[in-house]
């Protein structure tokens, strides 16, 4: 009896694992084995595919074959018993195009209100992704184990920290990789769960802001308690993208070590041009907080995004605010040649209730004010470019009294 060729051959490639699956064409014939040959582009001869010779099952692994993953390859299969079937040719394919990204490895660390996620490619030193190792981005799905309500976080790198979590709570997450340059989305990792710790005695510092004063950077933050000491550390932001790196060498800012105030001042020349991450930690001598949220600090933007300068013309029921270019040291205006949006906050001097106006124009009317009342105004600038999503610090507050009634014209 003539043996029939196997049919429906599927090639599955995940990272560096090359798996072939096929259907037997005749289930009634026993003790059949299967063998594959392969042929590279531009070659006439067929070569035996190692790992896929005389296979009794309908699956084989040819990962040991050292292929150029960017080169087209053709496969053929036949069945063998006493005689052999005719060859069945599989459509040619390029391994890299066909490959899927496997599940990444995930490592979790817990704090009281944060989880640190370290992600690395599932296959170490992968041949398939050798040229793309630095291009991996990751996305994750996280949920409270008790509720199951999922939150998605896109475009993260090999180290990511999730903040604002609840203490003593189990969170579960899964991660997948993507190579956006090749339009490839990977397979999710297994689900990893971790429980956040009991609440730490000292909370971390909050609301960290960097501003420029003269030739110095001024770093400010908020803290709940008095009589504390603080330290500030920095890290090159690009290091978070390095997939092989699990050690983040955070460095001290010398002028911000063991400071007793909620701010520190350090020379601009401490940092070369670049993007950095900054974090702050508090200590009372006995206990230490966890690190604050990490803020991104771009020297280029920081250097030129200064708080706006403005004048107020007071009327009885409104203020007219004229926004000008911020002043550098030496009172020279800074030329800012990129679009800005202004956030103006105003409040009655005797009240804490703030109102906000967002405006692209440099002349702004603040309406609906009461006559003969002192109002305070502060403003800050935001870049409108999404890539340079940056805000200046707020200007100092300026307080003015509105005029008596009927002077609004």
């Amino acid at each position: 009896k003539n043996l029939k060729s196997p049919q429906k051959v599927e090639v599955d490639i995940i990272d560096d694992n090359f798996i072939l699956r096929w259907n037997r064409s005749d289930e009634s014939v026993g003790n059949v084995t299967f063998s594959f040959d392969y042929q590279k582009t531009g070659m006439d001869n067929w070569i035996k595919l190692s790992g896929c010779q005389n296979i009794t099952s309908t699956k084989c692994n040819f990962s040991s074959l050292k292929l150029n993953v960017y080169e087209e390859i053709k496969l053929r299969i036949r069945a063998e018993k006493e005689n052999t079937s005719s060859w069945y040719e599989v459509d040619s394919f390029t391994p890299f195009r066909k490959a899927q990204i496997g599940p990444p490895e995930v490592h979790l660390e817990a704090e009281d209100k944060a989880i640190v996620i370290h992600i690395s490619p599932g296959t170490k030193d992968s041949v398939m992704w050798a040229l793309d190792g630095l291009s991996f981005t990751y996305s994750l799905v996280i949920w409270k184990n008790s509720s199951g309500v999922e939150e998605r976080i896109e475009n993260i790198y090999s180290r990511h920290k999730i903040y604002k979590l609840s203490p003593e709570t189990t969170y579960c997450l899964k991660v997948k990789a993507a190579l956006l340059t090749s339009w490839k989305i990977g397979v999710y990792s297994p689900v990893h769960c971790i429980k956040t710790t009991v609440e730490n005695e000292l909370p971390p510092p909050e609301n960290i802001e960097v501003s420029v004063q003269n030739q110095n950077y001024v770093l400010k933050w908020d803290y709940t308690y008095a009589n504390m000491t603080f330290q500030v550390q920095w890290l090159h932001a690009f290091l978070k993208r390095n997939p092989g790196n699990h050690l983040y060498k955070w460095k001290q800012i010398p002028d911000c070590e063991n400071v007793k105030t909620t701010q520190c001042v350090f020379p601009q020349n401490v940092f070369q041009k670049g993007i950095y991450l900054l974090r702050v930690q508090a200590s009372d001598g006995n206990n230490t907080s966890f690190w604050s949220e990490e803020i991104k600090f771009d020297t280029e933007i920081q250097a030129f995004l200064l708080p706006p300068v403005f004048n107020i013309r007071s009327l009885s029921d409104s203020f007219h605010i004229y926004i000008g270019a911020p002043k550098q040291s030496g009172n020279t205006p800074v030329i800012q040649d990129y679009p800005l949006i202004y956030e103006i906050i105003f409040w009655e001097n005797t009240s804490n209730a703030e109102r906000k106006i967002i405006e692209k124009k440099t002349d702004v009317t603040v309406p609906n004010l009461k006559p003969l009342t002192v109002y305070c105004v502060k403003a800050r600038a935001h870049t409108m470019d999404e890539k340079l999503n940056k805000s200046s610090v707020f200007s100092d507050a300026v307080c003015e009294k509105t005029k008596p009634g009927n002077t609004s014209k």
Partner: antibody, heavy 118, light 107 residues
Framework: EVHLQQSGAELVKPGTSLKLSCTAS????????IHWVKQRTEQGLEWIGR????????KYAPTFQGKATITADTSSNTAYLQLSSLTSEDTAVYYC???????????WGQGTTLTVSS | DIVMTQSQKFMSTSEGDRVSVTCKAS??????VVWYQQKPGQSPKALIY???YRYSGVPDRFTGSGSGTDFTLTISNVQSEDLAEYFC?????????FGAGTKLELK
């Protein structure tokens, strides 16, 4: 294969100084922190300090400040621990260890036995 | 400095038993805890990192658990080669500190 090879046992007199070495193979010390740990006979482990060989930045335990100086030479892939004004209290085994971020001290040297005796 | 307390200096066990070594931190150290095994005349061998992750090559009878201030190393089905001293260490904040050690011995 990752390996940390430490210098041999030492017998020295009180009041002297000594430099112990720890030579790494199988990895570049610039990519890690190298830590030093002290262990006295029948006692626990005491952390001495660490160095970032990339830029020489060091941190020390308060009890070893002034006693220990950690340095590194990236060209020979070696870290050093210098101990000064030695006394019998410094008699111990000294270990170097590689620190790999979240996975802690993943590789240790075999230890150097230091005996301080007159 | 953070104090790591291993309250039991010695623990007696028999082959095949399950034993738990505990370690308490004086402050919240998250999950930044390592467990080491040390045999006489040898350097410490890392077993568990990040409180619960096993180093490669470590038998799966060794498991770590805990977070914050309370940590446990459990050895299920104790083997004779597990008789050694076990140390915990925190690497959350400088100075890094070790527990005093717990010696596992045969009953």
């Amino acid at each position: 294969e990752v390996h940390l090879q430490q210098s041999g046992a030492e017998l020295v007199k009180p009041g002297t100084s000594l430099k112990l070495s720890c030579t790494a193979s199988g990895f570049n010390i610039k990519d890690y922190y190298i830590h030093w740990v002290k262990q006295r006979t029948e006692q626990g482990l005491e952390w001495i300090g660490r160095i970032d060989p990339e830029d020489g930045e060091t941190k020390y335990a308060p009890t070893f400040q002034g006693k220990a100086t950690i340095t590194a030479d990236t060209s020979s892939n070696t870290a050093y621990l210098q101990l000064s004004s030695l006394t019998s209290e410094d008699t111990a085994v000294y270990y170097c260890a590689r620190y790999n971020g979240y996975s802690g001290f993943d590789y240790w040297g075999q230890g150097t036995t230091l005996t301080v005796s007159s | 400095d953070i104090v790591m307390t291993q309250s039991q200096k010695f623990m007696s066990t028999s082959e095949g038993d399950r034993v738990s070594v505990t370690c308490k931190a004086s402050q919240n150290v998250g999950t930044n805890v390592v467990w080491y095994q040390q045999k006489p005349g040898q350097s410490p061998k890392a077993l568990i990192y990040s409180a619960s992750y096993r180093y490669s090559g470590v038998p799966d009878r060794f498991t770590g658990s805990g977070s914050g201030t309370d940590f446990t190393l459990t050895i299920s089905n104790v083997q004779s080669e597990d008789l050694a001293e076990y140390f915990c260490q925190q690497y959350n904040r400088y100075p890094f500190t070790f527990g005093a050690g717990t010696k596992l011995e045969l009953k």
